[in-house]
């Protein structure tokens, strides 16, 4: 499948999955916490104040990256509680914490958590590269 | 090797407008996140802006919100930022850098600036 | 917006010596705190990402620690190329900030 259509289908996989992940918190647009997301790269799950949300690392990185095998569920939700308890040596987990001013950025970064050959290619099919 | 070279630099009066670019190359450009940093002379880094692989998502320093636009082309490997109603307290050495990842990152990698000055 | 501090502003030292620059951010950042030095008339270069690891091409005598809202920066042994001013920068939340810098110079 083409890359541009395997994002608009994640990306309205997305919108479903936060759409039900609402109803089940009981969320609404007055709600503290964080409403889902997608930040043009991966699904991020609605979060509570103080929740620490994990993903496994996004179908991007299988394009980037095909020779690497990533898991393909989104990690449990069990511990959300110390931003500490990841690894930076554990490949293909990157988190967000949710608190009061909204989400911080990822950690750890992307490429950081997901791997990157950045001299693998240099002349690669710009059409893997220009994902709307 | 990563080469970043910002252009677009000089004098302008206060209200004007004025577009810095940087070339890229020794990377695969359009895999990566941009930002431009400002230092004042003699002063600190200030963060101004950060824009993903693929343009869109941007993101901006407060005191520039609304009045700068980060932009790429990645068919010419380019960053660009647009600097409308400039201030004196713009006035500044602007640096391009590689932020490490393809949404925001950290400037890894960075140009040699070009110095804005922003005077009556 | 989190705000960084770094102290002292500036330090004195001689080569061989151990400089220690510390880094305070308003809130956690986690570890998404990065250090770069600056020389004079030169771009800053990346040292030290996530708090703690180490990146090649940079000496093993640069080391940071810290997590949440305490870094440090420790140069175990001054070189006399050491001599520059550092900054600490946050990638934990938007808009990312640097901080003020410090500087270290020869005694």
């Known amino acids: 499948m083409h890359s541009d259509c395997i994002f608009k289908k994640e990306q309205a996989m997305c919108l479903e999955k936060i759409q039900r992940a609402n109803e089940l918190m009981g969320f609404n647009d007055s709600s503290p916490g964080c409403p889902g997301m997608w930040d043009n790269i991966t699904c991020w799950k609605p979060a509570h104040v103080g929740e620490m949300v994990l993903v496994s690392c996004p179908e991007l990185f299988r394009i980037f990256n095909p020779d690497q095998v990533w898991e393909t569920e989104t990690i449990g939700e069990s511990d959300f509680g110390d931003s500490n308890s990841l690894d930076l040596s554990d490949m293909g987990v990157v988190s967000r914490n949710c608190t009061e001013d909204g989400w911080s950025e990822p950690f750890p970064h992307y490429f950081d958590a997901c791997g990157f050959d950045e001299y693998e290619s240099e002349t690669g099919d710009q059409d893997y590269y220009y994902l709307s | 090797q990563v080469q970043l070279v910002e252009s677009g630099g000089g004098v302008v009066q206060p209200g004007r407008s004025l577009r810095l670019s940087c070339a890229a190359s020794g990377f695969t450009f359009s895999r990566f996140a941009m930002h431009w940093v400002r230092q004042a002379p003699g002063k600190g880094l200030e963060w101004v802006a950060v824009?993903?692989?693929?343009?869109?998502?941007?993101y901006y320093a407060r005191s520039v919100k609304g009045r700068f636009t980060i932009s790429r082309d990645n068919s010419k490997n380019t960053l660009y930022l647009q600097m409308n109603s400039l201030r004196a307290e713009d006035t500044a050495l602007f640096y391009c850098?590689?932020?490490?990842?393809?949404?925001?990152?950290?400037?890894?990698?960075w140009g040699q600036g070009t110095l804005v000055t922003v005077s009556s | 917006e989190i705000v960084l501090t770094q102290s002292p502003a500036t330090l004195s030292l001689s080569p061989g010596e151990r400089a220690t620059l510390s880094c305070r951010a308003s809130q956690s950042v986690g570890r998404s705190l990065h250090w770069y030095q600056q020389k004079p008339g030169q771009a800053p270069r990346l040292l030290i990402k996530y708090a703690s690891q180490s990146l090649s091409g940079i000496p093993a005598r640069f080391s940071g620690s810290g997590s949440g809202t305490d870094f440090t920066l420790t140069i175990s042994s001054l070189e006399p190329e050491d001599f520059a001013v550092y900054y600490c920068?946050?990638?934990?939340?938007?808009?990312?900030?640097f901080g003020p810098g410090t500087k270290v110079d020869i005694k």
């Open positions: 850098a590689r932020g490490y990842d393809i949404l925001t990152g950290y400037p890894d990698y």
């Open positions: 824009i993903s692989y693929d343009g869109n998502n941007k």
């Open positions: 920068h946050q990638s934990s939340r938007l808009p990312f900030t």
